[in-house]
């Protein structure tokens, strides 16, 4: 029940985390002017990932989208590459993990087949949530950066006659909703990791007792109940449970088929 | 088509007090930037205030911050301006004017007339 | 405060002759974000209201003629009349859009020479 309820859980915060990603990734305001300490202008800038826009208080807003690809920043190219990796891996890590989960039945999926499905869906949910919180770093870093260039050389004017003011960009929203939805990602990730570990079957050990008759020899293998609630008398790699007597005369070990460390 | 129709102008006595009314039609209020533009009698054009589109935040000129205040009731399509305070050197007409791109403004009321004297 | 300052403080010029204006901000109003200048031209006729003729320094207003144009960029704008027609006489005003206060030039008066 706990394995189910820290998978379930793991999955939803982990569709929260990349719902978050994909906002931040769409948003505008990964970058607004910065208002502190500056003249009041009429217009507001702030920068996206895919376009720049200027709000004026007219209640004009006009947005540019970034036409060229190659005269773009290299660090805003690194950012935006992050964020899709990050993106197209939390996509398919949500892909696998729905078919992971314990409550969803489909077919005669193995439990040990759901946990390696977990793990994989849990590394690619820790994956999408470190390329986020990256790619959100690395433009905060950047916005820092130039934040205290511009800052050096705020008024750059003629002789001091004529000031021109230099625009500064502060951190803008899309900043934090990608640091939170990286975050809560790479927790769901870690969830769905501990979850694999409960769902993982142990190493098994099938008792066979051997009755000695007269004349010949019939090893007996008691039958026992299965685990899984699905139909059928098929027991193969189910794990049963001992249900008859042993004796230390022969005793046969079969290990599961698949052994998790 | 977008109308303003400025009200409320008329004589006061130095200290007094004055509302100035704008109605606006033909365009959703709300979404647009509104101004208050002064003239002097035989002098040039002076900005007065300015409420934004969407925040509605305020802006005002040294001369009358702390005087003046503007205001919109977007539900009755409105803008007002309340002068307080009033000195001689607010005699002029008063226009109410809307703003749209690059904060320029478009549509103007045709005006209505402050007389500040005792 | 931003100081418009406008010249010549009037003008008259010849029907179909080309009149120009000039106007001079104390600081740029060139915005970086959108490399758009927030310079606006306006014409007033005596007795009414200014009408808008140019905004971010070089836009028409729909149903301004052709024959006005704007220009320059930073803290240096124009205003062009390339054929002067009798109905152009007015005063002339800029204003700044991008700095509050929003301050307007003193205005240029032109008249028919």
């Known amino acids: 029940m706990a394995v189910t309820a820290c998978q379930g859980l793991g999955f939803v915060v982990s569709l929260i985390g990349i719902a978050g990603i994909i906002a931040a990734t769409c948003m505008d305001q990964w970058s607004t002017q910065d208002l502190y300490n500056n003249p009041v202008t009429a217009v507001f800038n702030y920068q996206g990932l895919w376009r720049s826009c200027v709000r004026e208080s007219s209640g004009f807003t006009e947005c540019r989208g970034y036409f060229t690809l190659l005269g773009l920043p290299a660090m805003l190219q690194a950012v935006r590459a992050l964020m899709i990796v990050g993106i197209v891996l939390g996509a398919i890590g949500l892909l696998v993990s729905i078919f992971a989960l314990k409550c969803i039945r489909i077919g005669s999926m193995e439990d040990s087949a759901k946990a390696n499905m977990t793990l994989t869906s849990g590394i690619m949910f820790i994956v999408s949530g470190l390329c986020a919180i990256a790619g959100v770093s690395v433009f905060a870093n950047m916005l820092v950066t130039n934040f205290w260039m511009s800052t050096a050389n705020m008024y750059t004017g003629m002789g001091g006659m004529v000031q021109t003011v230099q625009t500064r960009y502060t951190f803008g929203a899309a900043l934090f909703v990608g640091w939170v939805a990286g975050g809560l990602t790479l927790i769901g990730g870690v969830m769905m990791c501990i979850a694999c570990r409960g769902l993982a079957p142990e190493e098994t050990n099938y008792k066979a007792v051997s009755y000695h008759a007269s004349g010949h020899s019939v090893a007996y293998k008691p039958g026992g109940f299965k685990a899984s609630t699905g139909f059928g008398s098929n027991t193969k790699n189910k794990k049963i449970y001992d249900g008859g007597a042993r004796t230390e005369d022969e005793v046969q070990s079969y290990p599961s088929k698949h052994d998790y460390v | 088509e977008v109308q303003l129709v400025e009200s409320g102008g008329g004589l006061v006595k130095p200290g007094g007090s004055l509302r100035l009314s704008c109605a606006a039609s033909g365009f959703t209020f709300s979404s647009y930037g509104m101004s208050w533009v002064r003239q002097a009698p035989g002098k040039g054009l002076e900005w007065v205030s300015t409420?934004?589109?969407?925040?509605?935040?305020?802006y005002y000129p040294d001369s009358v911050r702390g005087r003046f205040t503007i205001s919109r009731d977007n539900a009755k399509n409105s803008l007002y301006l309340q002068m307080n305070s009033l000195r001689a050197e607010d005699t002029a007409v008063y226009y109410c004017?809307?703003?749209?791109?690059?904060?320029?403004?478009?549509?103007w009321g045709q005006g209505t007339l402050v007389t500040v004297s005792s | 405060d931003i100081v418009m300052t406008q010249s010549p403080d009037s003008l008259a010029v010849s029907l179909g002759e080309r009149a120009t204006i000039n106007c001079k901000s104390s600081q740029s109003l060139l915005n970086s974000g959108n490399q758009r200048n927030y310079l606006t031209w306006y014409q007033q006729k005596p007795g009414q209201p200014p009408k808008l003729l140019i905004y971010w320094a070089s836009t028409r207003e729909s149903g301004v003629p052709d024959r006005f144009s704007g220009s320059g960029s930073g803290t240096d704008f124009t205003l062009t009349i390339s054929s002067l027609q009798a109905e152009d006489v007015a005063v002339y005003y800029c204003q700044n859009n991008y700095f509050y206060p929003f301050t307007f030039g003193q205005g240029t008066k032109l008249e028919i020479k």
């Open positions: 409420i934004s589109g969407g925040d509605s935040y305020t």
């Open positions: 004017a809307r703003s749209y791109n690059g904060n320029s403004l478009p549509y």
